[in-house]
Amino acid sequence: RKIPKVGHTFFQKPESCPPVPGGSMKLDIGIINENQRVSMSRNIESRSTSPWNYTVTWDPNRYPSEVVQAQCRNLGCINAQGKEDISMNSVPIQQETLVVRRKHQGCSVSFQLEKVLVTVGCTCVTPVIHHVQ
Amino acid sequence: RKIPKVGHTFFQKPESCPPVPGGSMKLDIGIINENQRVSMSRNIESRSTSPWNYTVTWDPNRYPSEVVQAQCRNLGCINAQGKEDISMNSVPIQQETLVVRRKHQGCSVSFQLEKVLVTVGCTCVTPVIHHVQ
């Protein structure tokens, strides 16, 4: 799902207030609900009829440093016999997410939000058009 | 996939530098890759064998203000005949994402990161346990 443009209003102070100096804002340390955890059913990536693999990307100047991307294993879907059925399609499910980018020059450290597209998993769909009969 | 704990290091200055004043950091205005957009196959939520609906939650003091949650429509999966097959299970795919929480007292505005669990869609899996024969 998509994140709308900031529209330069969310991060602004009310009009009656002096503007933010130097184009930056105050970001409080700590993360709300930091201990909240994804709870997904076990091994769904291999049990799915549209199975996927995970690839981890790592960047020490990004929070979270680890971003996991899914890739669908098949073009078709896996049928009850464990064979690929190309009359159905495995398709990725994508999500826009925010990460924080760290920028430093000596002791001057600043942060900036960055939008990242993450493929979270795959789902099996009936095709819109049949390339293959 | 899960976001690891901050571990109080990512947002800190190097040890040789003076500490961050008042427990806050500088967040630059603007979002890197703001124009990047999800490109997903059309209507996958209704074409999936594990279809889902979307619910929108709205909070003006959160960025993005709109967070979309998916809910699987069925317990089983939809077969080639368009009927629900309860020998297979529709399960949610979750993702941890970051949002920004805005806090203001008069002209003093600060921001804080918040972790949110988002259900992005659903996938059809072979069951771990057979509740139903």
Partner: nanobody
């Protein structure tokens, strides 16, 4: 913490009926299914029935199929279990719970249960 309140249990003769209800205080945004479970004295808790909040489709354990009917009222965050043709072996404490992974949910996935409602079927 989500709260679950089950009610409607009681003592009934074999062949009789009862209608259980369960109110969930707060549905998670992604929560899509609810289940009924039961635990007879000295036995493990077992699955009875499940329903999808959106689709409304219900599934049943073989032992209750054709006798029990699960339904839901989305506006009231309530699910029901209509139990007909009750048998002595249906005697148990009945619990409801959110099923975060639908039919993929296992007993290990729960860390919280309500107080349940006792159903006793006499012969």
């Amino acid at each position: 913490q989500v709260q679950l309140v089950e009610s409607g249990g009681g003592l009934v003769q074999a062949g009789g009926s009862l209608n259980l209800s369960c109110v969930i205080s707060r549905r998670t945004p992604s929560g899509y299914a609810m289940g009924w479970f039961r635990q007879a004295s000295g036995k493990e808790r077992e699955f009875v029935a499940a329903i999808s909040w959106i689709g409304g489709g219900a599934v049943y354990a073989d032992s209750v199929k054709g006798r029990f009917t699960m339904s839901r009222d989305n506006a009231k965050n309530t699910v029901y279990l209509q139990m007909n043709s009750l048998k002595p072996e249906d005697t148990a404490v009945y619990y409801c719970n959110d099923m975060p992974y639908g039919l993929d949910t296992t007993m290990d996935d729960y860390d919280y249960w309500g107080q349940g409602t006792l159903v006793t079927v006499s012969s």
